[in-house]
Amino acid sequence: APRGTQAEESPFVGNPGNITGARGLTGTLRCQLQVQGEPPEVHWLRDGQILELADSTQTQVPLGEDEQDDWIVVSQLRITSLQLSDTGQYQCLVFLGHQTFVSQPGYVGLEGLPYFLEEPEDRTVAANTPFNLSCQAQGPPEPVDLLWLQDAVPLATAPGHGPQRSLHVPGLNKTSSFSCEAHNAKGVTTSRTATITVLPQQPRNLHLVSRQPTELEVAWTPGLSGIYPLTHCTLQAVLSDDGMGIQAGEPDPPEEPLTSQASVPPHQLRLGSLHPHTPYHIRVACTSSQGPSSWTHWLPVETPEGVPLGPPENISATRNGSQAFVHWQEPRAPLQGTLLGYRLAYQGQDTPEVLMDIGLRQEVTLELQGDGSVSNLTVCVAAYTAAGDGPWSLPVPLEAWRPGQAQPVHQLVKEPSTPAFSWPWW
């Protein structure tokens, strides 16, 4: 067999061309080589690195009858939707045994209207509150100058003269639109239009005006709402669960809140149907036609104690000589607070009323004065909390004790010689 030639000459007979265009352009780079025998695989380089996921096609055409004759190999690299990351120097690469050959380079460039990397976003802001908007664009060609517009009115005399990447807005009193224009040598691109919705400011100074066991009256100071009057305010109250789980500013309460709406003005609301002697957290937000303000922080409040709403139940009173035994049960009606004890009053037909504080016991043995001949003796009992006494029970007549009727031994309570204090009889 004849001696072969040394593989020192490049097999490339066609090199990649140049592509310059705007973003989104589709183009093809092409290289061609001529080899003898089995055609090699053609690889593509960008800036000297193999493109592992290149969208390339390779066509091989034999120039003779025998597969050992010369072949023309054409490789085409397709660039779809040209991006900045596609730009650079492109070459074809083939390995012929241990020899490496690269084509002459072609170049892919990007040139067109500015391209936005960042555009202003829709957002809500509180009235008269400063905020920033962002806009960023690039070429090539550079430089790219920005011009901000508010409600379609330019905020500078010319592109590049006003704020560039960040626009600081000291505050708005009405809902407005913002956009930015990007200018380069090829022309102008306009960003999306961002709508900045002006909401009422957060209300301030939420506080208690008055307290009742089952209702709280609260008031607040409204925030600015720009040109949009407040339509209503919404108050939420939630059981505090002993303060667990709600910290100042925590976004959501642990359970479903009680929600009330208040017409405004006045910026005041009476919250009813509450539990007495119970800790709550309350917050308020105010709404205009543009939407609601942010909520205030949760404010801890507490309903005061009330008096028991009913008398003690199941009162029984029996008499045995000079002693009377009385016992009762806790009122079924709400106590509206912490039960501190019971008061008992008894009176005969012609004797003054005697009033006693029994404490938390639910029974008492009375030592009656005299020989026990007092007639028509009646007993009343009332429960009390720190807020005062609940209603007295109806008078219960003292029944004579019959043998066989159980009478436990109880601490005797001496009748005071005079009442501890006067109590209006029923």
Partner: antibody, heavy 121, light 111 residues
Framework: EVKLLESGGGLVQPEGSLKLSCVAS????????MSWVRQAPGKGLEWIGE????????NQTPSLKDKFIISRDNAKNTLYLQMSKVRSEDTALYYC??????????????WGQGTSVTVSS | ELQMTQSPASLAVSLGQRATISCRAS??????????MNWFQQKPGQPPKLLIY???NQGSGVPARFSGSGSGTDFSLNIHPMEEDDAAMYFC?????????FGGGTKLEIK
Amino acid sequence: EVKLLESGGGLVQPEGSLKLSCVASGFDFRRYWMSWVRQAPGKGLEWIGEINPAGSTINQTPSLKDKFIISRDNAKNTLYLQMSKVRSEDTALYYCVRLSVVFYYYGMDYWGQGTSVTVSS
Amino acid sequence: ELQMTQSPASLAVSLGQRATISCRASESVDNYGISFMNWFQQKPGQPPKLLIYAASNQGSGVPARFSGSGSGTDFSLNIHPMEEDDAAMYFCQQSKEVPPTFGGGTKLEIK
């Protein structure tokens, strides 16, 4: 199964000539680059050269270019190494090697058992 | 031509332990985003066998205990855990330039 069987080795006098052969089987010989590598007794490996599938292009170690000629006969599935002007430093085991694309580039993926050449007077 | 220097020249490793062989090139063997570095194993009386190509890729049928790493001029071959069958000569080889060149070899024995 890929097989490469070298032959033609033996004793040769200094300045003499020798032609080594390598018969390939188990693959389409006409589509592969082939190579020769040698290993002197107790020494490392030395690449001699390679030839393209058509036999038209040869890459060789510069120092051996004028002494050794690599060729192939695709009809016979045979690779050759024509050795001339041999010297004692050419004493070695001569391997026939197939090249394959391993990771974009070519790697020496199959080797014959080798044929021994001894240069001595 | 590109010189390849292997170390150590010989190495004895206990079964189950790790063997590490190093190879240094006289200049970088990286190009086009590829490391043109290969490793071969040669047992007595047998031809070399391709173990690792492109610095870290395992050849066909090569057990997972063989791994390669490195880039530029410094490369290594790791065998872990060492098995009896792994006692052999190991060669590194660069494919970046013609002529492709081999390291001097490392003889790996069982301790």
